[in-house]
């Protein structure tokens, strides 16, 4: 007992201040299990990682609430965190079925590229950045962003890394990323599309 | 409990088509992918292809277009795989398997059904 | 398609003893991989995803480690249930599987 509390608590101590805040929100339309009952949103948006942690046990007991912070996480496009969170809860444990993950709203945009529609996905699931990198170098990558993205450290931060770079591009630009992928991970896009 | 029952066993000529139904209870339905997987005897797991419940948008292994089709019935939480023109190649066992999330990951499978098995012969 | 070589067959083992079971991808597939036991007559179970988590109520001697294009599946301390067939599989891109390695008894 006591570690799936210490796995979220060390889970949302790692979230930035805004990536709390975006937490806390989703935490209020997250679907739950039938039988629990959602935090109230007055108490929850003004709690730091701490008390955060202990509502969320209280609430949903140490393995439904690790479960729910690691599907939460994952809707927020935070991959290796929510696969840590997972498994350090599961060292040993006899975890609980996995929940429901409800479907994100993804329909497509208008106006807004493949890219920019799914990013959250492609930070999670692109597995051979350097694929990509070795397709854009030259075109729309300087050699300094080809090695600013290489030197990070796991893919999720190589394709955050990518991605910072991304609001200086045009379409035509974005469609090179696109069709990279497509030779790349080609199942990957085919799924997104249809999502 | 998540349950994936599907139909039992096909006994078919070369040359027809034949539908497995896969019926799912336990979950909603519309929450998760359905994959469906061939075993030959003996032989390795091949991925034959998925399907969203939600808008019907299927994704094929290259190998099984035109082979294969996925649909879903989501009013009875039924996936169905129709193969045809069969030959004795098509001769296997056929899992119905439920992507375990989608969206932020790929497919893998955390529940499968017990099977179905299709023998062609004339 | 991403090819999963599992080079051992077959592999003789004891009761107690410490196994680890191999599989290579084709090219590099970051850790979207999963292992999944098949026991005679039965449907695969799933053991471990993203290469190392392991799945809900699996026993803590399965283990999975690996990235990029090596993966290995490890039983600490093996049992006579878990004789069975192994399955690697790769889901970075479309689905494929190894050609599974089976567990028997020396």
């Known amino acids: 007992m006591g570690r799936a509390r210490d796995a979220i608590l060390d889970a949302l101590e790692n979230l930035t201040a805004e990536e709390l805040k975006k937490f806390k929100l989703k935490l209020l339309s997250v679907p739950l299990r039938e039988g629990y009952g959602r935090i109230p949103r007055g108490a929850l948006l003004s709690m730091d990682a701490l008390d955060l942690t202990d509502k969320l046990v209280s609430f949903y007991l140490e393995t439904y609430g690790a479960e729910l912070t690691a599907n939460v996480l994952r809707d927020m496009g935070l991959q290796e965190m929510a696969g840590q969170l997972q498994a350090a809860t599961h060292q040993g444990s006899g975890a609980a079925p996995a929940g429901i993950q409800a479907p994100p709203q993804s329909a497509a945009k208008p106006g807004l590229h493949f890219i920019d529609q799914h990013r959250a996905a492609l930070i999670a699931r692109v597995t051979n950045v350097e694929w990509l990198l070795d397709a854009l170098y030259g075109k729309v990558l300087t050699d300094e962003q080809y090695q600013a993205v290489r030197a990070e450290p796991t893919n999720p931060s190589k394709m955050r890394k990518l991605f910072s770079f991304t609001p200086a591009w045009n379409w035509t630009c974005k469609d090179l990323l696109l069709q990279a992928l497509r030779e790349s991970q080609s199942y990957l896009v085919e799924d997104l599309e249809r999502s | 409990e998540v349950q994936l029952q599907e139909s039992g066993p096909e006994l078919v000529k070369p040359g027809s088509s034949v539908k497995i139904s896969c019926k799912a209870s336990g979950y909603t339905f519309a929450d998760h992918y359905m994959n469906w997987v061939k075993q030959s005897h003996g032989k390795s797991l091949e991925w034959i292809g998925d399907?969203?419940?939600?808008?019907?948008?299927?994704v094929y292994n290259q190998k099984f277009k035109g082979k294969a089709t996925l649909t879903v019935d989501k009013s009875s939480s039924t996936a169905y795989m129709e193969l045809r023109s069969l030959t004795s190649e098509d001769s296997a066992v056929y899992f119905c398997a439920r992507r375990r999330a989608h969206y932020y990951d790929g497919p893998y499978f955390d529940y499968w059904g017990q099977g179905t098995t299709l023998t062609v012969s004339s | 398609d991403i090819v999963m070589t599992q080079s051992q067959k077959f592999m003789s083992t004891s009761v107690g003893d410490r196994v680890s079971l191999t599989c290579k991808a084709s090219?590099?597939?970051?850790?979207?991989v999963a292992w999944y036991q098949q026991k005679p007559g039965q449907s695969p179970k799933l053991l471990i995803y993203s290469a190392s988590i392991r799945y809900t109520g699996v026993p803590d001697r399965f283990t999975g480690s690996g990235s990029g294009t090596d993966f290995t599946l490890t039983i600490s301390n093996m049992q006579s249930e878990d004789l069975a067939d192994y399955f690697c599989q790769q889901y970075s891109n479309y689905p494929t599987f190894g050609a599974g390695t089976k567990l028997e008894l020396k």
């Open positions: 090219q590099i597939v970051g850790t979207a």
């Open positions: 399907i969203n419940p939600n808008n019907g948008g299927s």
